[in-house]
Interface confidence: low
C-alpha cells in the first residue's frame, strides 16, 4: 500500500532551496531543537555488524586488514545523523564492547569534526531547502525502484543502534536516479523529534517536519561502502518527510508496532519483509536533489540527496510511538536525533519540477532563479 500523499507539491509550501544559505536560522538551535552534536555513524553499525550503511549510519571504514582486504556491504556500519545543535558538533564515544571504532552521539563532546574531519567540510548535510531558489531541471526524471516489494520471508533485521532505528535491507533492491545512475539499497532509518518538537533533518524554508525517513543506497559502481565514501555519487539517499495525518499508515505500522521489542539501545528484532516503497511518497517524479554528505560521522561528502516533494502521512499516535519508545545511550530517551542544517556554501539545489512557480507565499517577491546544471543530460 502506498503511503498517502500529504502535499502534492512542495512539501514545505515552496520556499527557497537554500542555495546560498551560509548559516541559516535553522543552523542555529531553535527552541524546538535542543542543541545536539552531530552524530557520526553508530558503532553498532560498524563493519562486521551486518548493518548496511545507512545515510546517517554510513559505515565507518575499518582498515582493510581487519576485513582481510574487503568489507562486505552487510558488514559496513551505518551512519546516523546528529541533531540540531546550536553549533553542529560531532561526538564520539565507545558504544560496544569489542568494537574498536569510535562511537558518536548527538550532543556532547568531542565535536564531530574531531571524530571525523569530514564533518567540517564545506558541502555537508542536511540543508534547508528553499523551493523558490531551486533550479528546475527537466533532465531529472522520475526515480525508478526495482525489487522494493519484499515477501514476508526472509525476515529483516530491525535494530535500535542508539541513534536511530534501522532496517537492514536484503540484496536486490535497486534504484535508478536516471540512466547510468544506478544504486542498491542498503538500509533505511528514521530521524525524529520529541513530544511537540519536530525532528526532520532537512527543513523547507526553515520549517522542520515531525520526522524524516532515509533510505541509503550504494552506487553499483562500487562493491563496498568504504570504496564509495567521499566519492561523488558513491552513495545516494532517498529522503522523505513524515507528517501527521488523520489515518494510521499501515506500511509504517509494520515497523512501529515492533519498536517496543527494541526499546533498549543495541537491541534488535526480526520483522517480516514488507513493501519498502510503501514507506515512501507515491510521487517519484517531484523531488529536490543536491550533493551533500552523511548527516552523521564520518560525514563523508559526495552523497547524492534526493528529497521528495510529497510527504508521507502517519497518525499522531504513530508519530508519538516513534519518538517516545526507544532509548539511547546513557539511559536517555532516543529523541531529537537530527543534525542541524548546514550551509549550502554555493551549492545549488535542483528540482525535478518547477518548484518556484506559484508554490511559495513569497512568489510575488523578485527571485533570482538558478539554472539547471544538468540541462543537457
Amino acid at each position: 500500500q502506498r503511503l498517502p500523499r500529504m502535499q502534492e507539491d512542495s512539501p514545505l509550501g515552496g520556499g527557497s532551496s537554500g542555495e546560498d544559505d551560509p548559516l541559516g536560522e535553522e543552523d542555529l538551535p531553535s527552541e524546538e531543537d535542543s542543541p545536539r552534536e552531530e552524530d557520526p555513524p553508530g558503532e553498532e553499525d560498524l563493519p562486521g555488524e551486518e548493518d548496511l550503511p545507512g545515510e546517517e549510519d554510513l559505515p565507518e571504514v575499518k582498515p582493510k586488514s581487519e576485513e582481510e582486504g574487503s568489507l562486505k556491504l552487510e558488514d559496513l556500519p551505518t551512519v546516523e545523523a546528529p541533531g540540531d545543535p546550536q553549533e553542529p558538533q560531532n561526538n564520539a564515544h565507545r558504544d560496544k564492547e569489542g568494537d574498536d571504532q569510535s562511537h558518536w552521539r548527538y550532543g556532547g563532546d568531542p565535536p564531530w569534526p574531531r571524530v571525523s574531519p569530514a564533518c567540517a567540510g564545506r558541502f555537508q548535510s542536511p540543508v534547508d531547502i528553499r523551493p523558490q531558489l531551486a533550479a528546475f531541471c527537466p533532465a531529472l526524471r522520475p526515480l525508478e525502484l526495482l525489487g522494493f516489494q519484499l515477501p514476508p520471508l526472509p525476515e529483516l533485521r530491525l535494530r535500535n543502534n542508539g541513534h536511530s532505528v534501522q532496517l537492514t535491507l536484503p540484496p536486490g533492491l535497486e534504484m535508478a536516479l536516471g540512466p547510468g545512475r544506478e544504486y542498491r539499497a542498503l538500509q533505511l532509518h528514521l530521524h525524529w523529534g520529541a513530544a511537540g518538537r519536530p525532528g526532520s533533518e532537512h527543513t523547507v524554508e526553515g520549517h522542520r517536519f515531525p520526522a524524516e525517513i532515509h533510505v541509503v543506497h550504494l552506487s553499483t559502481a562500487f562493491a563496498r561502502v568504504d570504496e564509495a565514501l567521499g566519492r561523488p555519487g558513491g552513495l545516494a539517499v532517498l529522503a522523505a518527510f513524515l507528517e501527521e495525518g488523520p489515518e494510521e499508515n499501515s506500511a509504517y505500522e509494520q515497523l512501529l508496532s515492533r519498536l517496543e521489542e527494541i526499546a533498549e539501545e543495541g537491541s534488535e528484532t526480526q520483522v517480516p519483509g514488507l513493501d519498502i516503497s510503501a514507506l515512501l511518497p507515491s510521487d517519484f517524479s517531484r523531488y529536490f536533489q543536491y550533493e551533500g554528505s552523511l548527516t552523521t560521522p564520518p560525514c563523508a561528502q559526495g552523497v547524492i540527496w534526493t528529497v521528495f516533494n510529497q510527504t508521507v502521512m502517519l497518525s499522531a499516535k504513530q508519530l508519538h510511538t516513534l519518538s517516545d519508545t526507544l532509548w539511547g545511550p546513557g539511559d536517555s530517551r532516543l529523541q531529537l536525533n537530527f543534525r542541524a542544517t548546514q550551509p549550502l556554501n554555493g551549492r545549488v539545489i535542483e528540482a525535478s519540477f518547477p518548484a518556484g512557480v506559484d508554490s511559495s507565499p513569497r512568489a510575488a517577491e523578485p527571485v533570482q532563479l538558478n539554472s539547471c546544471l544538468a540541462a543537457g543530460d
Partner: nanobody, 120 residues
Framework: QVQLQESGGGLMQPGGSLTLSCAVP????????IGWFRQAPGKEREFVAA????????QYSDSAKGRFTISRDNSKNTGYLQMNSLKPEDTATYYC?????????????WGQGTQVTVSS
C-alpha cells in the same frame, strides 16, 4: 486511458521461437519499466520478465530464465520479449505492462494481451 498494445503472438511448434512486441505511449516508455506477464486458461496471471526504463536491469521468472530475453527500444517506444525453445506449457495470453517498478503490483498500464499457443 493509456493502452499498451501487444503483438506477435501465434501458433508455434515446440522448440520454436517467437518475439512479442509491446507498443508503449511515448510519455510512458520514457521512464517506466516494462513487464511481461502471462495467463494460461484456468490459471492466475504470472510474471514472466521485466526491464527497467534505462534497460540496465532485467528480471525473469524461473521458467523464463535462459529461454526468454526481454529488451526495449526507447527510440521506437517498444518493448520486446523474445521466446526461444518454446514448450507447450508456455501456451497462454501474454500481457505487457508499464509501471514505475518492475513488480506487477505497481504497474499502472496494461495491454489487452496476445495469444501464444505452443502445440505440435
Amino acid at each position: 486511458q493509456v493502452q499498451l498494445q501487444e503483438s506477435g503472438g501465434g501458433l508455434m511448434q515446440p522448440g520454436g521461437s517467437l518475439t512479442l512486441s509491446c507498443a508503449v505511449p511515448r510519455f510512458t516508455l520514457d521512464y517506466y519499466a516494462i513487464g511481461w506477464f502471462r495467463q494460461a486458461p484456468g490459471k492466475e496471471r504470472e510474471f514472466v520478465a521485466a526491464i527497467s526504463w534505462s534497460g540496465g536491469t532485467t528480471q525473469y521468472s524461473d521458467s523464463a530464465k535462459g529461454r526468454f530475453t526481454i529488451s526495449r527500444d526507447n527510440s521506437k517506444n517498444t518493448g520486446y520479449l523474445q521466446m526461444n525453445s518454446l514448450k507447450p506449457e508456455d501456451t497462454a495470453t501474454y500481457y505487457c505492462a508499464a509501471g514505475r517498478q518492475l513488480e506487477w503490483r505497481t504497474y499502472d498500464y496494461w495491454g489487452q494481451g496476445t495469444q501464444v499457443t505452443v502445440s505440435s
